[in-house]
Interface confidence: low
């Protein structure tokens, strides 16, 4: 239904707290360099204006679209050109082009320092002094570093943060209460960020149809007892919600997500038997819970997939009459039978099925042509299964850090032109797949591994798009989203690469490394490892292991030495010489 004032409508639906949080996220995601105070001031102005519209929908400017209202606010910021360069040109455009322009200027890798967590006492003091401002800072800092973070989910993580602080700040040992809990929230939020970025990439590059296919597969796996019409309705609604969030329409997105959660909870009987626990929770927790609810038990009496999609005499007729619906039902039927497959794999199978029908339905004897299609799925299924087995075996043998190093070597060989920080970030993220997925039961490993890897590789592609340096990466990133992971897996050593010269300073370290947190130490060592591979792309695993063991021993020795500086300055050059010899 049309509302006289869109901003009043959203304020009423969402309530002041969520309204303010979402406006803050929106501004922080668009203008990523502005300080919290600058954004907080704009948020207050927008909220005050929304309240005047709630009181009188006919008041001046209350009928304007949210894009117009928010865009005007952003464009009124002083020194916009000095701080944001060509983004200021967006302000010369009219809606909807102005909003599109803002979206195009979102930076996936802003040059902001890492979000450092203050120590426990300081955190608790500022939280107690002003919880609202404290949470505002959290929303601002996360949103500007992750400009596509799913806004209603970010409100959920802020709520989690709030609950943890409320609990832990009342304890004697605040540090040991806060650290593991906040680490857990951070890890989940980072995964949520890369997953959502993948959804927005899908929407931006391939449109709503591609995202809807993803949603049909995912929902069919989770709700195998829901019928196709129900799954289609949920997929359509979910597509709308994600389109809005990816497009910067955060108030509409959060409002529609709440509506979808309400619908699901009112229609549990036709969706899934597993929703009740989620539906008993308050809004943010409810929507989050529904998004990761466990799969419903599969119906026991599902007929073989071949009956409708291979053996039926009307296959080509059904396909010709309504291609999207027929392919949609295939994806639905296949996905509900395979919660053990990744969504990426299911979409590859649907694509293979579509290509087979396109070819075979034009031939003289279609059934003879498409009769073997299910058997032709086998290699497509085996490939990711082997990937999971090989990588989980390696992870179980090496542990997370060793596994990350193995991936780092592999990916540096595949794309040595990519910057070392990007390679290290990618390898560390890809390596976490072991901890995240390899401990799961067998039937959950494949979907966990492949869909997580796809999301991480999407980030690699986004970063590479900014400064393309590797033909290998460009090739894999140019294809469809579901083919990316197999493409990267199939890459081998880049034979066109001219090895980097050996620079001693790249492998020169100082005593300050000793006081770094473990994570930072690992990154330093991994940076050196990537540089070694760039110097000797064909070094054997054994050679690299020798050098890295030597390096670890050197750090251990010098960090325990009484005179660390002397140890580093005398032993460092010896280490460099030994490295060169080992790799000769």
């Amino acid at each position: 239904e049309a509302h006289k004032s869109e901003i009043a409508h959203r304020y009423n639906d969402l309530g002041e707290q969520h309204f303010k949080g979402l406006v803050l996220i929106a501004f922080s995601q668009y203008l990523q360099k502005c300080s919290y105070d600058e954004h907080a001031k704009l948020v207050q102005e927008v909220t005050d204006f929304a309240k005047t519209c709630v009181a009188d929908e006919s008041a001046a400017n209350c009928d304007k679209s949210l894009h117009t209202l928010f865009g005007d606010k952003l464009c009124a910021i002083p020194n916009l050109r000095e701080n944001y360069g060509e983004l200021a040109d967006c302000c010369t455009k009219q809606e909807p082009e102005r909003n599109e322009c803002f979206l195009q200027h979102k930076d996936d890798n802003p040059s902001l320092p890492p979000f450092e967590r203050p120590e426990a006492e300081a955190m608790c003091t500022s939280f107690k002094e002003n919880p609202t401002t404290f949470m505002g800072h959290y929303l601002h800092e996360v949103a500007r570093r992750h400009p596509y973070f799913y806004a209603p989910e970010l409100l959920y993580y802020a709520e989690q943060y709030n609950e943890i602080l409320t609990q832990c700040c009342a304890e004697a040992d605040k540090e040991s209460c806060l650290t593991p809990k906040l680490d857990g929230v951070k890890e989940k939020a980072l995964v949520s960020s890369v997953r959502q970025r993948m959804k927005c990439s899908s929407m931006q590059k391939f449109g709503e149809r591609a995202f809807k296919a993803w949603a049909v597969a995912r929902l069919s796996q989770t709700f195998p007892n829901a019928d196709f019409a129900e799954i289609t309705k949920l997929a359509t609604d979910l597509t709308k919600v994600n389109k809005e969030c990816c497009h910067g329409d955060l108030l509409e997105c959060a409002d529609d997500r709440a509506e979808l959660a309400k619908y699901m909870c009112e229609n549990q009987a036709t969706i899934s038997s597993k929703l009740q626990t989620c539906c008993d929770k308050p809004l943010l927790k409810k929507a989050h819970c529904l998004s990761e609810v466990e799969h419903d038990t599969m119906p026991a009496d599902l007929p073989a997939i071949a009956a409708d999609f291979v053996e039926d005499q009307e296959v080509c007729k059904n396909y010709a009459e309504a291609k999207d619906v027929f392919l949609g039902t295939f994806l639905y039927e296949y996905s509900r039978r395979h919660p053990d497959y990744s969504v990426s794999l299911l979409l590859r199978l649907a694509k293979k099925y579509e290509a087979t029908l396109e070819k075979c339905c034009a031939e003289a004897n279609p059934p003879a042509c498409y009769g073997t299609v299910l058997a032709e799925f086998q290699p497509l299924v085996e490939e990711p299964k082997n990937l999971v087995k090989t990588n989980c075996d390696l992870y179980e043998k090496l542990g997370e850090y060793g596994f990350q190093n193995a991936i780092l070597v592999r990916y540096t060989q595949k794309a040595p032109q990519v910057s070392t920080p990007t390679l290290v970030e990618a390898a560390r993220n890809l390596g976490r797949v072991g901890t995240k997925c390899c401990t799961l039961p067998e039937d959950q490993r494949l979907p966990c591994v492949e869909d997580y890897l796809s999301a991480i590789l999407n980030r690699v592609c986004l970063l590479h798009e900014k400064t393309p340096v590797s033909e290998h990466v460009t090739k894999c990133c140019s294809g469809s989203l579901v083919e990316r992971r197999p493409c990267f897996s199939a890459l081998t050593v880049d034979e066109t690469y001219v090895p980097k010269e050996f620079k001693a300073e790249t492998f020169t370290f100082h005593s300050d490394i000793c006081t770094l947190p473990e994570k930072e130490k690992q990154i330093k060592k991994q940076t050196a490892l990537a540089e070694l591979v760039k110097h000797k792309p064909k070094a054997t695993a054994e050679q690299l292991k020798t050098v890295m063991d030597d390096f670890a021993q050197f750090l251990d020795t010098c960090c325990k030495a009484a005179d660390k500086d002397t140890c580093f300055s005398t032993e460092g050059p010896n280490l460099v010489t030994r490295c060169k010899d080992a790799l000769a």
Epitope: K436, T439, L440
Partner: nanobody, 114 residues
Amino acid sequence: QVQLQESGGGLVQPGGSLRLTCTASGFTFRSFGMSWVRQAPGKGLEWVSAISADGSDKRYADSVKGRFTISRDNGKKMLTLDMNSLKPEDTAVYYCVIGRGSPASQGTQVTVSS
């Protein structure tokens, strides 16, 4: 070398409780997901529960959901399985394993019988 030592098994009546503990050494415990698996007399290995390296992600087999709780203490290199409302069908040798690997230890016998 890698060592895993389970303890805490025993004879318990149906409805009773036990706490199994697994002490790890010889590897960086905090870097690995861990699981509990069990083998009932004359049966194959059955996966029971798993926990991620940082303890944030816990999974259970349907047969034990709501009755068993897995936890870990990375500082003490210790994995725990709290078992409540035990049933005769829980009778088995329980092993702790790295990731989803195979048992490489003696295990601990749990017998549920009246």
